[in-house]
């Protein structure tokens, strides 16, 4: 028998630094977790004390926080390098910056191999692209060879920016002619490391022939045996086991997100390379791992470009960005106006004719929005200005929901309406009228949305049997200020760009704004 | 059906350097590793280098580690081995070999070229 | 480094016979065991992999057996084209090493 180690992340998303328990900003460094120099130490002490690892990434990398902001991706080719990692998977956010800004900064400069066998270049793109990423990968390992076949998530024409020349096939129509390929070059443990979300992790297990084991990303998963370390709750056991259609137990595993646990799987294959057994879990990256001292002087040298960027300006505001939450808690506010027409911009994707784009829809929790910003500073604005309007390092998400479950979800807004809660709606491409004199449950008396299968935008009302694209924050799509609803009755969830990037980049593109208070909620007469 | 034609073999003085190419043909080149194995006149076989099918990752016996330098060009289906530094004890057929299975199956070798090392 | 040691240097037999060729290595190998056949002006040629897989083409009077440091090359029956000299060939961390050889002539 022959034993292999895989050490996994998933979805770091830009957490460089350490962070706080819930994976924003370290604040008290003592609590703090992950990053990199902490994920190097536990990295190398599993390297001396086994003889066959690798450490895999499945994508989702790009996009989180203002490393990725200010360097593009330059920064997470030079500390994956650092900690020489064996392969990576493209995920959807790694063409946030279009397919440019993934070849210049990463495909470039990694020394690992870049994986995913269900993208497809064609056009002028094919020969600019060719073999800067690859379908699958075969590593020696100890005195053995692995086979690792990328896959990425086909709804990435949706969620970033891959242009018009990369297809995005079916993951496990795509995967098995390059597993078939690796078992006739007699490679016999093959690896599916990709970005596609748990439930096609298990399927891709399920049905393709030939894969030993998947290591996945996208849907954050947290798997766990036992008593769990931290916060996250676990959705099932690591590794999680299918049974595949040709009867063999095929191990899946994620690592939950944003670096804050490294996977940790060991698998023993037979002389055959069949899977004769296999454990492991997540490993919390808390304060017990020292940070490696000499990436850590690293990430502090990186670290000073940051702090100057966050001072410069991104663009200017002739009006009052009006954040109070005497405003956006209780009525319209030109900030909430603001921060749904950049999610809305920051979503443009022109996928289909029919279609003048795919989402016409935000809203957004008033009491997410912390603080305003005066414009008689200049009108400039600042990223260490919209840090304190967006303070919590979230992102802002894609859903599916049904009619019904947005008009629950507007029925909440006002429920209690008049306390100063957070749960008042804030929204984009979406006109809502309130009668507060009916009782709670019952307040919402018009509700229009935007159409997308239209050449001219208009307002329809909203039908409760239809299925809505809707932008919103993480914090809602997670069922906080209380829109269980969402949670509950999503249909789809795919996690977005970081909140403050999104705002930083539409503000810079617009260069001088002036949003107003133009009437998408109102009251009716008499009732307010 | 495979084939392996080396050249590039010839007398160099010792400390000179020397060139080999390997034409490869019937085969999907950039799937396998391929090796050089080299033969003294009148012994046996002694390996000399390993190029993984993309060139990712090369290996060299102790012999020859910091003189030769194994690549490929997959676009052209050539083999090379760059020999500097060269001895007498360098001497040898140089074979060109295909690895079918991960350094377990070298499984097609090409006819070999003469080096010969010698003031 | 792993050193091959083969035995005998020479083996000689008449047509028909068995040929038993010995192999071991410093240390264990595993499976990763090779034996070549080499006729004198001409490339080597594969016979066994993996210490007991017969090579594509290669007749069933060959088979190789052994694990770890101690392995066999068997000829059945010695046909005249079988008299060569026979290497046996190991890999343990993609570096490889080919025993000194085991002429088989005619006796």
């Known amino acids: 028998a022959w034993e292999l180690t895989i050490l996994h992340t998933n979805d770091v998303h830009s957490r460089l630094e350490q962070t706080s328990e819930d994976s924003s900003k370290c604040v008290n460094a003592s609590r703090c977790m992950g990053g990199v120099a902490r994920l190097f130490t536990k990295v190398q002490q599993i390297r001396r004390a086994e003889p066959n690892v690798l450490l895999l990434d499945a994508g989702d990398q790009y996009q989180g926080t203002i490393w990725f902001t200010v360097y593009k991706g330059a920064e997470v080719a030079h500390f994956m390098n650092a900690l020489r990692y064996d392969a990576m998977a493209l995920g959807n956010h790694e063409f946030d910056n279009g397919v440019e800004g993934l070849i210049e900064p990463l495909l470039k400069e990694a020394k690992f191999p870049i994986l995913s066998a269900n993208i497809k270049a064609k056009g002028p793109l094919a020969s600019q692209i060719s073999g800067l990423y690859l379908p699958y990968k075969v590593l020696p390992v100890g005195d053995e060879v692995v086979g690792i076949v990328g896959y990425t998530s086909k709804e990435t024409p949706f969620l970033s920016n891959p242009g018009t020349n990369l297809v995005f096939e079916d993951e496990i129509t795509a995967l098995q002619p390059e597993v078939d390929k690796l078992k006739t070059l007699n490679v016999n443990k093959i690896i599916a490391l990709g970005h596609s979300g748990f439930e096609m992790d298990k399927l891709i297990a399920q049905k393709v022939r030939g894969v030993d084991v998947v290591v996945g990303g996208h849907s954050n998963t947290f798997l766990y045996t036992g008593n769990p370390p931290s916060k996250e709750v676990p959705a099932g056991k690591y590794p999680f086991i299918v049974t595949s259609d040709d009867g063999r137990k095929v191990p899946v595993v994620q690592a939950y997100a944003f670096g804050k646990y490294l996977g940790y799987l060991k698998i023993e294959f037979d002389e055959r390379g069949n899977v004769i057994s296999s454990h492991g879990n997540p490993i919390l990256l808390n304060s017990s791992i020292p940070e490696d001292p000499s990436i850590k002087a690293d990430i502090n040298k990186w670290r000073i470009k940051l702090d100057n960027y966050s001072t410069q300006e991104l663009g200017k505001t002739i009006v009052y960005l009006d954040g109070s939450s005497q405003s956006c808690r209780f009525r319209e506010c030109n900030m909430g106006n603001l921060i749904c027409d950049a999610m809305i911009n920051n979503n443009l994707r022109h996928t289909d004719e029919m279609f003048w784009n795919h989402v016409s829809m935000c809203i957004l929790n008033g009491g997410g929005i912390r603080s305003p910003i005066d414009e008689r500073n200049n009108g400039t604005i600042t990223w260490e200005n919209l840090a304190a309007v967006l303070p919590f390092g979230g992102t802002f998400d894609l859903v599916q929901l049904k009619g019904s479950t947005l008009k629950k979800a507007f029925e909440h807004s006002v429920h209690r309406y008049g306390q100063s809660t957070g749960e008042f709606l804030q929204v984009g491409g979406i006109h809502v009228v309130y009668d507060l004199s009916r009782k709670p449950g019952d307040r919402v008396v018009k509700l229009d949305v935007l159409c997308t299968k239209c050449r001219v935008p208009s307002y329809d009302p909203l039908k409760m049997d239809e299925v809505y694209k809707v932008i919103l924050p993480n914090f809602l799509a997670n069922g906080g200020d209380g829109f269980q609803m969402i949670k509950d009755e999503l249909l789809r969830h795919d996690s977005g760009d970081q909140d403050i990037n999104v705002v930083s980049t539409y503000i810079s593109k617009m260069k001088v704004i002036y949003p107003a208070v133009e009437g998408r909620i109102k009251f009716s007469t008499g009732s307010h | 059906q495979v084939q392996l034609v080396e050249s590039g073999g010839g007398v160099a003085q010792p400390g000179r350097s020397l060139s080999l190419s390997c034409a490869a043909s019937?085969?999907?080149?950039?799937?396998?590793?391929m090796h050089w194995v080299r033969q003294a006149p009148g012994k046996g076989l002694e390996w000399v280098a390993l190029?993984?099918?993309?060139?990712?990752?090369?290996y060299y016996a102790d012999s020859v580690k910091g003189r030769f330098s194994i690549s490929r060009d997959n676009s052209k289906n050539t083999l090379y081995l760059q020999m500097n530094s060269l001895r007498a004890e360098d001497t040898a057929v140089y074979y060109c070999?295909?690895?079918?299975?991960?350094?377990?199956?070298?499984?097609?070798w090409g006819q070999g070229t003469l080096v010969t090392v010698s003031s | 480094k792993i050193v091959m040691t083969q035995s005998p240097a020479t083996l000689s037999l008449s047509p028909g016979e068995r040929a038993t060729l010995s192999c071991r290595a410093s240390q264990s190998v595993s499976r990763y065991l090779a034996w070549y056949q080499q006729k004198p002006g001409q490339a080597p040629r594969l016979l066994i992999y993996?210490?007991?897989n017969r090579a594509t083409g290669i007749p069933a009077r060959f088979s190789g057996s052994g694990s770890g440091t101690d392995f066999t090359l068997t000829i059945s029956s010695l046909e005249p084209e079988d008299f060569a000299v026979y290497y046996c060939q190991q890999r343990s961390n993609w570096i490889f090493t080919f025993g000194p050889g085991t002429k088989v002539d005619i006796k």
């Open positions: 993996d210490a007991s």
């Open positions: 070999v295909r690895d079918a299975q991960w350094g377990s199956r070298l499984d097609y």
């Open positions: 190029i993984w099918y993309d060139a990712s990752f090369e």
């Open positions: 019937g085969f999907t080149f950039s799937d396998y590793g």
